[in-house]
Interface confidence: medium
C-alpha cells in the first residue's frame, strides 16, 4: 500500500493576512486565524513529518479584500509560489479582472500548474493562453505519480468576466476524456480538483470513471468528522464518501473558505491505484499555530502600499450620501440606491441576445449601511470612507429565488416597521409599495420588478411562481436579519465580490456620482 497526504484549500478569497474568527479583519491577534504565514507553518510541519504530500488549491484565491484590489492577483502568485503549492484549479473569481487579469499576474507568474479541463479557449485567445493553464497535470510524488484533473463552474460567464473566447463546458463531459487519457498514460491515482460546488463534486465522484478523490470548492462547504473546532457547522463527514456508478467508494472533500482551515486527507492506495482507505479532517489554523516569520515579514512588506491606497480618492460625490440609520432603516435612502446600482453594474453580463442582462434586481438590508458620506469634503470618496459604510467585509452574492420567497422577504422588511431595525430593505430594479395600516405579513400592496428578458427594461408585477435572480449581501443569503426564508428557499447561491470593492469600482468608473431618492420604495397614502 502507498499513502498520500492531500493538503487543500479553497475559496481563500484574498485572506493573505490572518483574520478574525468570522474571516473579517483581525482585531485581537491572540484570537485570529488563518493567513498565509500560519498556513505555511502547518504545511511545513506536515511536509517534514510525512513522505508523500500534495498541497492543492481548488480555486477562488482572487477577490475578497483590499489585497486583491491593489495587487490584482500578483499577491496570489507570489505567496502561493512561496508556499510551494503543487497545483491549483481555476475558480470563477479568477476571471473577475477579465482573461488578461488572470494571464498576466497569475498564469504567467505561477510556478505550479493551474488546471481546468472544461474551459476551452477559442479565437485569438487560444494561442495566447495555450499552455498557461492545463486540463490535467501528472505530478511525481515520492516514487509514484498522481494525476490531477481540474474543473471550473460552468456558470462562470454569469458570475465573472471570462469574455467571449472561453467556452465553459459541462464538467462531467469534459473530465471523462481527460481521465481516460491519464489512464492510457498508466496513471492510476487520479484526483479531480475543481471549483463547481459540493453538489457537482459529488456528481463527479459518482459519474466520472477513474477519479479516485475529489477536492472541491465554490460552495464553502465545511465537512468534519467528530466535534467541530470552531463556529462552522459540518454539512457532512470528512471525507464525504460517494459510491460511484461503478461501485467504488470515492472520498469528496472541501475545506470551508477564507484560509481558516487546511484540509488534511490521508489516502491509502493499493498497487493498482485503488483507494483502500481515506481519513482526515480540516485543521483549524488558530493562534496556537505560530505565523512563519519569513512569510509574515513578506506580508508586512507588501502591506506598506495597502495602507496608503485606502486614503486615495476613488471618485467624487456632488450630493450627500445618506447612509444614516434614521433614513436607511425607515425609507428609501440614496446610499442604498448607490450601493444597489453598483451591485447591478458589477453583474452586467451580456451573455444572451434575448436578455439585456441576466439579473436586474438588488436587495440590501438597511442595517448593513453603517455610515453616511458628506459631500462637503471636496466631494472626495476614499476606500476608507467606504469601509465605514460597509465595515463587515461581506460579499455581494447572486441567488435565485422564487417570486413567493421575494414577497415573504419584503413582508419581513416591514413586519415590525418603525423600530429602527436592520431588516428594512433598500432596493434596485424593484418598485415596492407598503401599506403600514395593514397587519404584519400583509403590508406589501405592490411589488414590481425590472424585466431581464427584454430589450427595453420596464417594471412588471412580480410573479409568485417565477424564478428570479437577485443580487444581495451574503449576510442576507445566509438568513441574516431574520431573512430565514431566503436561506431556506433559495434555489441557487453563488458567492460574489467584496462589497467595498464593488462600490469602489463603480464610483471609480462613474467618476462623479449623484444618487437620488427616486421612488423605488413608497408607502401608500395615509399610512406613513
Amino acid at each position: 500500500a502507498w499513502e498520500l497526504t492531500i493538503l487543500h484549500t479553497n475559496d481563500v478569497h484574498s485572506r493573505l493576512e490572518q483574520t478574525s474568527e468570522d474571516s473579517s479583519k483581525c482585531v485581537n491577534a491572540s484570537r485570529c486565524m488563518g493567513g498565509v504565514a500560519r498556513l505555511f507553518t502547518k504545511v511545513q510541519q506536515i511536509r517534514r513529518a510525512e513522505p508523500n504530500v500534495l498541497l492543492l488549491d481548488a480555486g477562488d484565491q482572487y477577490q475578497g479584500t483590499i489585497w486583491f484590489t491593489v495587487y490584482k492577483g500578483a499577491e496570489v502568485a507570489h505567496f502561493m509560489n512561496a508556499l510551494r503549492y503543487d497545483a491549483m484549479a481555476l475558480g470563477n473569481h479568477e476571471f473577475d479582472n477579465g482573461v488578461e487579469g488572470l494571464i498576466e499576474p497569475l498564469l504567467k507568474e505561477a510556478k505550479f500548474p493551474i488546471l481546468s479541463a472544461n474551459i476551452k479557449a477559442k479565437g485569438p485567445l487560444a494561442s495566447q493562453i495555450s499552455g498557461l493553464y492545463l486540463p490535467y497535470k501528472v505530478l511525481p510524488v515520492g516514487d509514484e505519480v498522481v494525476g490531477i484533473v481540474g474543473y471550473t463552474s460552468k456558470e462562470t460567464p454569469f458570475l465573472s468576466n471570462p469574455g467571449t473566447n472561453l467556452v465553459f463546458e459541462d464538467e462531467i463531459t469534459a473530465l471523462q476524456p481527460e481521465v481516460d487519457k491519464l489512464k492510457t498514460l498508466n496513471v492510476n491515482k487520479i484526483i479531480a480538483l475543481g471549483h463547481s460546488g459540493f453538489e457537482m463534486d459529488k456528481l463527479i465522484a459518482q459519474k466520472v470513471r477513474g477519479v479516485d478523490v475529489v477536492v472541491g470548492g465554490h460552495s464553502n462547504t465545511f465537512l468534519y468528522t467528530g466535534n467541530p473546532p470552531s463556529k462552522e457547522v459540518p454539512a457532512g463527514k470528512y471525507p464525504f464518501i460517494v459510491t460511484s456508478d461503478d461501485g467504488r467508494k470515492v472520498p469528496v472533500v472541501q475545506a470551508y473558505a477564507f484560509g481558516k482551515y487546511l484540509g488534511y486527507l490521508k489516502i491509502e492506495f493499493d498497487e493498482r491505484g485503488n483507494v483502500i482507505s481515506s481519513h482526515g479532517n480540516p485543521i483549524l489554523l488558530n493562534s496556537s499555530i505560530p505565523e512563519d516569520p519569513s512569510i509574515k515579514a513578506d506580508i508586512n512588506k507588501w502591506r506598506i502600499k495597502l495602507d496608503n491606497y485606502s486614503t486615495q480618492e476613488l471618485g467624487k460625490t456632488i450630493v450627500y450620501l445618506d447612509g444614516s440609520s434614521q433614513s436607511c432603516r425607515f425609507r428609501e435612502c440614496n446610499m442604498g440606491n448607490l450601493i444597489c446600482d453598483a451591485m447591478i453594474n458589477n453583474n452586467l453580463r451580456h451573455t444572451d441576445e434575448m436578455f439585456w442582462n441576466h439579473v436586474s434586481m438588488c436587495i440590501l438590508n438597511g442595517g448593513g449601511i453603517r455610515s453616511p458620506i458628506d459631500e462637503r469634503n471636496n466631494g472626495t470618496i476614499t476606500w476608507e470612507n467606504l469601509a465605514a459604510v460597509l465595515p463587515f467585509g461581506g460579499t455581494f452574492d447572486l441567488v435565485q429565488l422564487k417570486g413567493s420567497t421575494l414577497k415573504k422577504a419584503f413582508e419581513h422588511s416591514v413586519h415590525r416597521y418603525g423600530q429602527s431595525t436592520g431588516e428594512f430593505l433598500q432596493v434596485g430594479g424593484i418598485h415596492v409599495v407598503y401599506d403600514l395600516s395593514r397587519k404584519p405579513g400583509d403590508r406589501v400592496v405592490k411589488l414590481d420588478v425590472l424585466c431581464t428578458k427584454c430589450r427595453v427594461p420596464s417594471y412588471d408585477p412580480l410573479k409568485m411562481d417565477e424564478v428570479y435572480k437577485v443580487i444581495l449581501p451574503n449576510f442576507l443569503a445566509n438568513g441574516g436579519d431574520g431573512f430565514q426564508m431566503i436561506k431556506d428557499e433559495l434555489l441557487r447561491h453563488d458567492s460574489g465580490d467584496q462589497d467595498i470593492n464593488v462600490v469602489s469600482t463603480y464610483i471609480s468608473k462613474m467618476k462623479v456620482i449623484y444618487p437620488a431618492v427616486e421612488g423605488r420604495i413608497k408607502f401608500s397614502t395615509g399610512s406613513h
Epitope: 484590489t69 491593489v70 495587487y71 490584482k72 492577483g73 500578483a74 502568485a77 507570489h78 498576466e104 499576474p105 504567467k108 507568474e109 516569520p293 509574515k296 515579514a297 508586512n300 512588506k301 507588501w302 506598506i304 502600499k305 495602507d307 496608503n308 491606497y309 486615495q312
Partner: antibody, heavy 122, light 111 residues
C-alpha cells in the same frame, strides 16, 4: 535582461508641462512598482512617487502631489511622469526605477533608468 | 516623513582603507526582524546602483567588500579594502512607510 529606457532630455519654459517616459523590458511590467525619483544638479535624491502598473494605483510625495501625475500603459510596458507648472527649481535629472518589492528587495530600487534631464529656463 | 541623516558628508581615503558611512533615521525603520533600509552607489553622470537591501543583504553582482548592518534607527555601510573604482556618492534609503526618503548622500574620494 531587465532594462528601463527613458525618453530624451527636455528643455521647458516656466509654467509649462513635461511628460517623460520609461519603457521597461525583461520582466513582467504589471507585477512590480515603478518609482520616480529626481536629483537636482549637485544635490541628493528625492522620491516623487510610484505606480503599480497592474492596477494603476499610485502614491505621491505630498510635496509634489498637486503638480505630478504618474501613469502607465500596460500594452507597451511604459510608465510616465507628467509634471505641470514647472519652475526653475524643478530643473533636475529624473529617474525611473523598478522596485523589487515582489521578491526580496523590499521596495529597494533594484534597476534604474538612465535618467532624463529636464531643464526649466526662460 | 522619516528623515535620514548620513555622516560624514565627505570622506577622503587611500586605497585598501576601510570606510564606514552611517545613516540615522528619525524613526524606527525595522519590524518583524527586518530592517527596511537600503544603500546605493552613484558615480558621476550615472544612475544610482543598489548595493545593499534590507540593511545587510548584498545585491547580486556587488563585490563582498561592501557590507551593511544595523537595526531600528542606526545603520552602517562598510567598504573594506576600498578600491579606486569605489569613488562615488553613497546614499541610504528607507522603505518602511510612505513617502520613501533618501539620506543627503556621502561623497567618497580616493586619494
Amino acid at each position: 535582461e531587465v532594462q528601463l529606457v527613458q525618453s530624451g532630455a527636455e528643455v521647458k519654459k516656466p509654467g509649462a508641462t513635461v511628460k517623460i517616459s520609461c519603457k521597461v523590458s525583461g520582466y513582467t511590467f504589471t507585477s512590480y512598482w515603478i518609482t520616480w525619483i529626481r536629483q537636482p544638479p549637485g544635490k541628493g535624491l528625492e522620491w516623487i512617487g510610484d505606480i503599480y502598473p497592474g492596477s494603476g494605483n499610485t502614491n505621491y510625495n505630498e510635496k509634489f502631489k498637486t503638480r505630478v501625475t504618474i501613469s502607465a500603459d500596460k500594452s507597451i510596458s511604459t510608465a510616465y511622469l507628467q509634471w505641470s507648472s514647472l519652475k526653475a527649481s524643478d530643473t533636475a535629472m529624473y529617474y525611473c526605477a523598478k522596485e523589487g518589492g515582489l521578491t526580496t528587495e523590499d521596495y529597494a530600487l533594484d534597476y534604474w533608468g538612465q535618467g532624463t534631464l529636464v531643464t526649466v529656463s526662460s | 516623513e522619516i528623515v535620514l541623516t548620513q555622516s560624514p558628508d565627505f570622506q577622503s581615503v587611500t586605497p585598501k582603507e576601510k570606510v564606514t558611512i552611517t545613516c540615522r533615521a528619525s524613526k524606527n525603520v525595522s519590524t518583524s526582524g527586518y530592517s527596511y533600509m537600503h544603500w546605493y552607489q552613484q558615480k558621476p553622470g550615472k544612475a544610482p546602483k543598489l548595493l545593499i537591501y534590507l540593511a545587510s543583504n548584498l545585491e547580486s553582482g556587488i563585490p563582498p567588500r561592501f557590507s551593511g548592518s544595523g537595526y531600528g534607527t542606526d545603520f552602517t555601510l562598510t567598504i573594506n579594502n576600498i578600491e579606486s573604482e569605489d569613488a562615488a556618492y553613497y546614499f541610504c534609503q528607507h522603505s518602511r512607510e510612505l513617502p520613501f526618503t533618501f539620506g543627503q548622500g556621502t561623497k567618497v574620494e580616493i586619494k
